[in-house]
Interface confidence: medium
């Protein structure tokens, strides 16, 4: 014999204060799967956390944090303060970047530094943990003949990356 | 959506081994360590180790050091807890948990482990 | 390794009434790696307070943490039915982590 509660499709909970008719989810709950005798309370997003995907009938909130903080943990059930600049998060808590990478942001990896010989330039302006390098002229722009020096070119625009 | 999935429960004869698996989805599970904690029945929580998936650093408590190996498959997103020689008191649900450097945060549903002959 | 007593095992309480749990440890542990986990019959274990005052996300703001030291408490300040629950106070300081024995709490 088949259970009637099978029936019930994601987004509702068989009732069996009403023989076990499939009633909606009551307002902030859900069911994300079908045949549920209840529906679970929406997680809600307070504080230090904010929400990022509301809840619906059939699916969770979803939470991340506050600027100037974030998430720790799968499904970021904790907030945390960034780290500094010329760090990154990593599962062991805020890192230095490793010698050759670098991070402008409080957030985000650590990514290398750019590598000016590869445009034919040189090192104008060495990188940090902070910063990355500043390309200067080629070396040929630099010789004691030439007629013009060539302006650094800009810092590539950093990356943003998600958490 | 963030999950671990436990393996099905297992019944086991006493001096046989048995192994769990956790696989991860939602996320990489080289980002977090994986811990496996157990729970006897009407009991509390015990930790056994944890395993950083991303180099395969292991840390075991002493009691369950030559009883419990940690493994992962990265290319599967997947943890394992491998016990050896299951007496009566080895039966428990036990859970794997993802964690950063200070707290366990999500758990898989559990697995159930019954030792008997 | 670091003994967490919990106190009481188990207690009732009314609804709407204030409720605090105890958490003692054999020595001293930082408060951020000092946590709680709720867990009901048939469910995993979730995360609840995290270093040691800190909501996790979707726990309501009736619920606080305090303590520093070996000394630490959970508090309910209206006791509702969903409350009904194991509480584990657990620490990370130090290898290897420990969990307390869990105080149940129960509905008068």
């Known amino acids: 014999l088949q259970d009637p509660c099978s029936n019930c499709p994601a987004g509702t909970f068989c009732d069996n204060n009403r023989n076990q008719i499939c009633s909606p989810c009551p307002p902030n709950s859900f069911s994300s799967a079908g045949g549920q005798r209840t529906c679970d309370i929406c997680r809600q997003c307070k504080g230090v956390f904010r929400t990022r995907k509301e809840c619906s009938s059939t699916s969770n909130a979803e939470c991340d944090c506050t600027p100037g903080f974030h998430c720790l943990g799968a499904g970021c059930s904790m907030c945390e303060q960034d780290c500094k600049q010329g760090q990154e998060l990593t599962k062991k808590g805020c890192k230095d970047c490793c010698f050759g990478t670098f991070n402008d942001q409080k957030r985000g990896i650590c990514r290398p530094w750019t590598n000016c010989s590869l445009d034919g330039k040189s090192v104008l302006v060495n990188g940090t943990k902070e910063r990355d390098v500043v390309c200067g002229p080629s070396p040929a722009d630099l010789s004691p003949g030439a007629s013009s020096v060539t302006p650094p070119a800009p810092a590539r625009e950093p990356g943003h990356s998600p958490q | 959506e963030v999950q671990l999935q436990q393996s099905g429960a297992e019944l086991v004869r006493p001096g046989a081994s048995v192994k769990l698996s956790c696989t991860a989805s939602?996320?990489?599970?080289?980002?977090?360590?994986i811990h496996w904690v157990n729970q006897r029945p009407e009991q509390g929580l015990e930790w056994i180790g944890r395993?950083?998936?991303?180099?395969?650093?292991?840390a075991y408590a002493p009691k369950f050091q030559d009883k419990a190996t940690l493994t992962v498959d990265t290319s599967s997103n997947t943890a394992y807890l491998h016990i050896i020689g299951l007496t009566s008191e080895d039966t428990a649900v036990y859970y794997c948990?993802?964690?950063?450097?200070?707290?366990?945060?999500?758990w898989g549903q559990g697995t159930s482990v019954t030792v008997s002959s | 390794q670091i003994v967490l007593t919990q106190s009481p095992a188990i207690m009732s309480a009314s609804l709407g009434e204030r409720v605090t749990m105890t958490c003692t440890a054999s020595?001293?542990?930082?408060?951020?790696?000092l946590h709680w986990y709720q867990q009901k019959p048939g469910s995993s274990p979730k995360l609840w307070i995290y270093?040691?005052?800190n909501l996790a996300s979707g726990v309501p703001a009736r619920f606080s943490g305090s303590g520093s030291g070996t000394s630490y408490s959970l508090t309910i300040s209206s006791m509702e039915a969903e409350d009904a629950a194991t509480y584990y106070c657990?620490?990370?300081?130090?290898?290897?982590?420990?969990f307390g024995s869990g105080t149940k709490l129960e509905i008068k």
């Open positions: 948990t993802t964690g950063n450097y200070y707290a366990m945060d999500f």
């Open positions: 939602g996320f990489n599970i080289k980002d977090y360590y």
């Open positions: 395993i950083d998936p991303e180099d395969g650093d292991i």
């Open positions: 020595s001293s542990v930082s408060s951020s790696y």
């Open positions: 270093s040691t005052s």
């Open positions: 657990h620490q990370y300081h130090r290898s290897p982590p420990t």
